[in-house]
Amino acid sequence: LIQERRSHEVNPAAHLTGANSSLTGSGGPLLWETQLGLAFLRGLSYHDGALVVTKAGYYYIYSKVQLGGVGCPLGLASTITHGLYKRTPRYPEELELLVSQQSPCGRATSSSRVWWDSSFLGGVVHLEAGEEVVVRVLDERLVRLRDGTRSYFGAFMV
Amino acid sequence: LIQERRSHEVNPAAHLTGANSSLTGSGGPLLWETQLGLAFLRGLSYHDGALVVTKAGYYYIYSKVQLGGVGCPLGLASTITHGLYKRTPRYPEELELLVSQQSPCGRATSSSRVWWDSSFLGGVVHLEAGEEVVVRVLDERLVRLRDGTRSYFGAFMV
Amino acid sequence: LIQERRSHEVNPAAHLTGANSSLTGSGGPLLWETQLGLAFLRGLSYHDGALVVTKAGYYYIYSKVQLGGVGCPLGLASTITHGLYKRTPRYPEELELLVSQQSPCGRATSSSRVWWDSSFLGGVVHLEAGEEVVVRVLDERLVRLRDGTRSYFGAFMV
């Protein structure tokens, strides 16, 4: 069926924010605050870092992460990958949706220089009911969390 | 009442563009062109740099600023902060909504090197009627304005 | 007439993805995948790199390009320009809509250093039926394509 937006329905939307618990160090996706502060869920649900779709359709999904550091940690890859990925029951592996690669450490010309950088992703994807979207950052050691305004994750139906 | 988008109503949207008058140097927010060229207001109003909400709801708000310079001005903080902030009568201090920090000067390895960088922010926030959203950049001396396409500010209800 | 979104109509939207054929080297706009993988067209059409509007209205248009290289190619301008441009039958030249300038090569402190950067643009513009939007990157030699997730172009009516 062609997706329509009916006038009596609430349009699904969500905005999730970063918190100290976002970075697990476990190799899993980032986790998010879903209720307090700027965070909300409307017509979408949340599970273990994932926005879970309850109504099939086309969604504009987005994420921003704040990166920062002092010089470059030893052993840190020169590339940071920030991506939005889809989990679907039909496939065992996550599917890449929107991805960025950046080399922010290269900005610091000395090993003691503080640097900041930001990565923003946004785009329209089709999602079925029950499918999930997560955010991953590799290497997450460079993600800087503060007050939920600098790193976040959201979506709305278009 | 649950917010709905009724089919007979126009969906609020706006896109404001940078102009020579955007940078005041007064410590206030950036000012914007609201009518000429690509700029428009539809179901939102404008006051002293702020997009003013006339209809409560969830809005995707966004801003991009073009940064640039030659080397790094003496005394310039190594961090540029670009943010979207909310003003509401009950809370006299602006509330952070979406914020990015960048260190673009660090890209220039010599003091005479020209550099350019761009910062984009976008996300969904809830706004009540009468609330205002503004854009701030610290240090605004590095914002480069030209013809309204490189620095801008907008919103639409989702 | 004021643009309205009627409940029986499908909302125009599209997401086009980068492919090996995107970079033509001809000085024209980037070309895009429109059907395979994550790419789709709904209520918009495509022609030679351009999203073509079939229904007049306000659209949020966006593009991301993945940039990367090893050092800086000789003769490469220190500035990369990534922009969204409008083609309209009324004017012979493309009109700038949203543009970013970046100096990503400056991040690499040695000529053999691999670097990555990403440029994101998004904003609301008014488009008439028949008007077209294209993406241009100058210098496109630094655009890095891979599997349609890193460089893309899309729009939806707001």
Epitope: N20, T34, Q35, L36, G43, R146 | L1, E128 | -
Partner: antibody, heavy 117, light 110 residues
Framework: QVQLVQSGAEVKKPGASVKVSCRAS????????MHWVRQAPGQRLEWMGW????????KYSQKFQGRVTITRDTSASTAYMELSGLRSEDTAVYYC??????????WGQGTLVTVSS | QSALTQPASVSGSPGQSITISCTGT?????????VSWYQQHPGKAPKLMIY???KRPSGVSNRFSGSKSGNTASLTISGLQAEDEADYYC??????????FGGGTKLTVL
Amino acid sequence: QVQLVQSGAEVKKPGASVKVSCRASGYTFTSYLMHWVRQAPGQRLEWMGWINVGNGNTKYSQKFQGRVTITRDTSASTAYMELSGLRSEDTAVYYCARNYYNWFDPWGQGTLVTVSS
Amino acid sequence: QSALTQPASVSGSPGQSITISCTGTSSDVGGYNYVSWYQQHPGKAPKLMIYDVSKRPSGVSNRFSGSKSGNTASLTISGLQAEDEADYYCFSYAGSSTVVFGGGTKLTVL
């Protein structure tokens, strides 16, 4: 202006339940969480739980888990807190408070619940 | 979630300044700039005095100020007045959609 108005005082027997209401006005009711906080005579404020008025999600303090139920009626812009299995130590003033970003503002005027045999 | 630690009581004379501390952990007070303070007069509902560590809502006197260092937040009242006598509570976001109150401090104006 933004306002929360609570229902009147209640006297209940041990083992009974009480349901306190909180009517909101002056803002978009469905776009904010509503918290419930209680204060026994001479004691500190004690957070009980919240409801996401938009989607009905709830979170309760472990202390009250299983005994408290927070609900809402969006058409009436009203939130409710029901506490069951009342005991004498539940005698307290019960407050509703709107969650605005990361603080509580405004608060309801409070509802005194007295549990007495 | 354990309550944040506040002194049970503080006192001061009119015109003096007093400070009330609120100690938590790196998971609440120390982890976020989301500390707020509430004033409660006997028989009245609490009233917001400070939010986001140091910001004042409109209508609150500038004699009230907030700050934070590490895991401890502080409320300072300068130029103490008789009407400041009340109970004061700190409150913090604690991550994962949880919140925590302080134990409360009784301010006596001598």
